[in-house]
């Protein structure tokens, strides 16, 4: 969370940002709100990245100004225009890519004052684990599997009734990479599983962790699996 | 409210360029990009090319080498140049615009040209 | 280049039937898929926008859903003003691509 203050005058408006992470692929958001501030055609919100000539996306006088769009972001930015009123400063960017990442800055003027605030984006590839009982293999074992994972993860087993066992001799882990070159299919084996417990399958990088459960009784296989983003709030 | 009208179609014998302007409306181009897509008589759409607010373009692999796009914001004009123009050229024309800055689909089109490569 | 493959190619239904024509693009392409109303001699007409928003001054009667690959037109209940050709769009990526497009006859 990174609160920006500025001044014009005897007037300073709170900007608000949140550094969020980027699913390569898919679309983003990147969060910014400021003191509401009714009167709309007097609202500039401008976008900036550093390092980048021109802007990421402006907004002013009610409506998009793209005219000095830095060429990167052509066709993939827009604010959420009807919540502009309500301090909402936010920017949606299509098609993430990895190149996205770096420090963006939100300023914005009102009637009230200016004010900016930074934000750092990270980007990268992350995914939920889905794990299932591999039927094929010689010995009961469970298969981990994430679909899209970048930079590269570690990926760690744990169990409910072997707690702080080392699962890493008894499991083998594969990364194979995707059709674009850049994300990776995430594979792991776990061996010689027993009945009537509760595996865990737990991917991380620097940008997420995800954690894939299996409980294997003799009546039933449970399952379930969540995602954190990580440095994010 | 929003307008876009094609105009500079006609007949063009094979070899010679074509050019087209597309005069907007109803909003600035400084705020949306314009889409050229065209159709072949009794075909499907075809996508050609994109200019953005920026000035900026993006065209369609397979008629990079042909295509030119200019605008000029003070005349709300967008111009679309193609040549070495052949028969399967032959194709309604339209410019288009985005129902949003991010491209979720085309929402205003143009009432379309008529282009007729025939010598 | 992404491929839209829109089926059927076409489709007789009745006034007041409900109708579904499906879209499978060739790889991923979120929620950027859009559908297009045509009738002969005149320029397509947005219905679907982002999937599943439907355009301003579009009837309830259609709706669209989808994400990923696999993306679906419905019309709840046909209106004689419906037949016409109907066409999906992909945004996602350059260059950007529609379906050969599916014919919607008066039974």
């Known amino acids: 969370l990174i609160i920006g203050f500025g001044i014009s005058g005897k007037h300073f408006i709170t900007v608000t940002t949140f550094t969020s992470a980027g699913n390569i692929g898919e679309d983003g958001t990147l969060s910014c709100t400021f003191e509401p501030d009714i009167k709309l055609n007097g609202i500039v919100i401008q976008w900036l990245k550093e390092g980048i000539k021109g802007l990421v996306h402006e907004f002013k006088e009610g409506k998009d100004d793209l005219s000095q769009q830095h060429e990167m972001f052509r066709g993939r930015t827009a604010v959420f225009a009807d919540q502009v009123v309500v301090g909402n400063a936010s920017l949606r960017l299509k098609n993430v890519q990895l190149t996205d990442a770096g420090t963006y800055t939100c300023y914005i003027r009102t009637s009230k004052g200016k004010g900016n605030a930074n934000l750092e984006y990270k980007t990268g590839a992350f995914s939920m684990p889905e794990i299932n009982v591999d039927y094929n293999a010689s010995s009961e074992s469970l298969r981990c599997e994430a679909p899209r994972w970048f930079p590269q993860p570690t990926v760690a087993w744990a169990s409910q009734v072997d707690q702080g066992a080392n699962f890493s001799e008894v499991s083998n882990t594969s990364f194979e990479l995707n059709s674009e070159n850049v994300t990776m299919k995430v594979v792991s084996v776990l061996y010689n599983v027993t009945i009537n417990n509760t595996y865990s399958c737990m991917i991380e990088n620097d940008i997420a962790k995800a954690t894939g459960d299996i409980k294997v009784t003799d009546s039933e296989v449970k399952r379930r699996s969540q995602l954190q983003l990580l440095n994010s709030g | 409210q929003v307008q876009l009208v094609e105009s500079g179609g006609g007949v063009v014998q094979p070899g010679r360029s074509l050019r087209l302007s597309c005069a907007v409306s109803?909003?600035?181009?400084?705020?949306?990009?314009v889409q050229w897509v065209r159709q072949a008589p009794g075909k499907g759409l075809e996508w050609l090319a994109v200019i953005w607010s920026s000035g900026s373009t993006d065209y369609n692999a397979a008629f990079l080498s042909r295509l030119t796009i200019s605008k000029d914001n003070s005349k709300n004009t967008v111009y679309f140049q193609m040549n070495s123009l052949r028969a399967e050229d032959t194709a309604v024309y339209y410019c288009?615009?985005?129902?949003?800055?991010?491209?979720?689909?085309?929402?205003?089109w143009g009432q379309g040209t008529l282009v007729t490569v025939s010598s | 280049d992404i491929q839209m493959t829109q089926s059927p190619s076409s489709l007789s239904a009745s006034v007041g039937d409900r109708v579904t024509i499906t879209c499978k693009a060739s790889?991923?392409?979120?929620?950027?898929v859009s559908w297009y109303q045509q009738k002969p001699g005149k320029a397509p007409k947005l219905l679907i926008y982002?999937?599943?928003n439907r355009y301003t001054g579009v009837p309830s009667r259609f709706s669209g859903s989808g994400s990923g690959t696999d993306f679906t037109l419905t019309i709840s209940s046909l209106q004689p003003e419906d037949f016409a050709t109907y066409y999906c769009g992909q945004t996602y990526s350059y260059p950007f691509t529609f379906g050969q497009g599916t014919k919607l006859e008066i039974k």
């Open positions: 790889e991923k392409v979120g929620t950027y």
């Open positions: 288009a615009r985005d129902v949003t800055t991010i491209v979720e689909g085309f929402a205003h």
């Open positions: 982002g999937a599943s």
């Open positions: 109803g909003f600035s181009l400084t705020s949306y990009g």
